[in-house]
């Protein structure tokens, strides 16, 4: 039962991570206008994301602009976009692998194969978490570097946006959830009493984790 509980927790965490990652990736709040001292640097607040940028005027009016073209983007922005999408897709793949190996599914009958699939899904989620972490940390590094660069004008200095914090949370959840899934299946036949009971019970396994669990994928 403990193993099944950890699996459920792992999948819930990865699902939350995936949602966080998706929101982080989509929101144009990777970089936000910096505050220096007690006053805003400029009369307008700038939000910069992977897909668009928004300018919030002092009147409260917001204008968002989707980046003009896919190719006419700096390489670091293109890389962050790509890693974001890849991380989300990798997590979805991890979910599919997990569902195939979940105890409540009949895609795979053999218990050892199911355990291997759950372990694989955990590894995939961990990879997704790492992929999510890369663009977030890279962007944070660039923001901090520019913030302390004396040649960067005050109006161009940015602070860490909400999307970065969501990205870190997403990465953490994916890594934690994936790690839990890896830990629940050290080997195919070592599931102890719960495995024994499931093998000899005439009723459906008591621990059927909901197949609706999403693989959590992080954003970027």
């Amino acid at each position: 039962m403990a193993s099944a509980g950890m699996q459920i927790l792992g999948v819930v965490l990865t699902l939350l991570g995936w949602v966080n990652g998706l929101v982080s990736c989509a929101l144009p709040m990777w970089k936000v206008t910096a505050f220096i001292g007690n006053s805003i640097v400029v009369a307008q607040v700038v939000w910069e994301g992977l897909w668009m940028s928004c300018v919030v005027q002092s009147t409260g009016q917001m204008q968002c602009k989707v980046y003009d073209s896919l190719l006419a983007l700096p390489q670091d922005l293109q890389a962050a976009r790509a890693l974001c999408v890849i991380a989300l897709l990798v997590a979805l793949f991890g979910l599919l692998v997990y569902l195939a190996g979940a105890k409540c599914t009949t895609c795979v009958e053999e218990k050892d194969s199911k355990a291997r699939l759950v372990l694989t899904s955990g590894i995939v989620f961990v990879i997704s978490g790492v992929l999510t972490l890369i663009p977030v940390c890279w962007t944070a590094h660039a923001i901090i570097r520019d913030f302390y660069n004396p040649l960067v004008a005050e109006a161009q200095k940015r602070e860490l946006g909400a999307s970065l914090y969501l990205g870190w949370a997403a990465s953490g959840l994916l890594l934690l959830g994936g790690g839990l899934l890896c830990c629940t299946c050290p080997s195919g036949g070592s599931q102890g009493p719960s495995h024994y009971m499931a093998r000899y019970s005439t009723s459906a396994p008591a621990i059927s984790r909901g197949p609706s669990e999403y693989p959590t994928k992080n954003y970027v």
């Epitope: 640097v41 190719l71 006419a72 983007l73 700096p74 922005l77 004008a153 109006a155 161009q156």
Partner: antibody, heavy 121, light 107 residues
Framework: QVQLVQSGAEVKKPGASVKVSCKAS????????MHWVRQAPGQSLEWIGY????????SYNQKFKGRATMTVDKSTSTVYMELSSLRSEDTAVYNC??????????????WGQGTLVTVSS | DIQMTQSPSSLSASVGDRVTITCKAS??????LAWYQQKPGKVPKLLIS???SLETGVPSRFSGSGSGTDYTLTISSLQPEDVATYYC?????????FGGGTKLEIK
């Protein structure tokens, strides 16, 4: 509105120095870098360098390093560009221009009216 | 230093024509490119930044494109007021450099 007002035309002899001023108004002076660009008669634009008015940090085109000096007077919101060891090929219109932008949309959005510096013996 | 080569150096076109000016960088500039318009006796005016983004107030007949080392400024339908010299500027690395300019005239 944003305005950059430069000092008047100068005539200098070879080997002398010239100091051009650029007074900014209509925005927070210390928030935007100020660039200097020159244009010789009938020629293209040439980037000299820029200064961060907030802390005086500068970046120069290597071609002018050692000859160009950019300074800031925050009290009057004025940027200065001094060019020493003048030669005839330094005859040009010198412009200050404000650098602005975000994400990857950057450019010189406001320009001073230009200062003609003539170097002649 | 990154060299910016603009072509043609001058061109003459009729009102309503589609005009294309190209700018080639000697190295990859990651789309850090701006286009300026300079009318006779005036200071340059920023038209496009980030290779493709039209500045506020610039007529939509102007557009920018390109990537890597090759960039283009296009005027979809030439107007008499477009007579000027056009410059590209890279800001991917210092020193920021300008192209040699393209002088545009009306036939």
């Amino acid at each position: 509105q944003v305005q950059l007002v430069q000092s008047g035309a100068e005539v200098k002899k070879p080997g002398a120095s010239v100091k051009v001023s650029c007074k900014a108004s209509g925005y927070t002076f210390t928030d935007y870098n100020m660039h200097w660009v020159r244009q010789a008669p009938g020629q293209s634009l040439e980037w000299i360098g820029y200064v961060n008015p907030n802390n005086g940090a500068t970046s120069y085109n290597q071609k002018f390093k050692g000859r160009a000096t950019m300074t800031v007077d925050k009290s009057t919101s004025t940027v200065y560009m001094e060019l020493s060891s003048l030669r005839s090929e330094d005859t040009a219109v010198y412009n200050c221009a404000r650098w602005d932008g975000y994400v990857y949309y950057y450019g010189l959005d406001y320009w001073g009216q230009g200062t003609l510096v003539t170097v002649s013996s | 230093d990154i060299q910016m080569t603009q072509s043609p150096s001058s061109l003459s076109a009729s009102v309503g024509d589609r005009v294309t000016i190209t700018c080639k960088a000697s190295d990859h500039i990651n789309n850090w490119l701006a286009w300026y318009q300079q009318k006779p006796g005036k200071v340059p005016k920023l038209l496009i930044s980030g290779a493709t983004s039209l500045e506020t107030g610039v007529p939509s007949r102007f557009s920018g494109s390109g990537s890597g080392t090759d960039y283009t400024l296009t005027i979809s339908s030439l107007q008499p007021e477009d007579v000027a010299t056009y410059y590209c500027q890279q800001y991917g690395s210092t020193p920021y450099t300008f192209g040699g300019g393209t002088k545009l005239e009306i036939k």
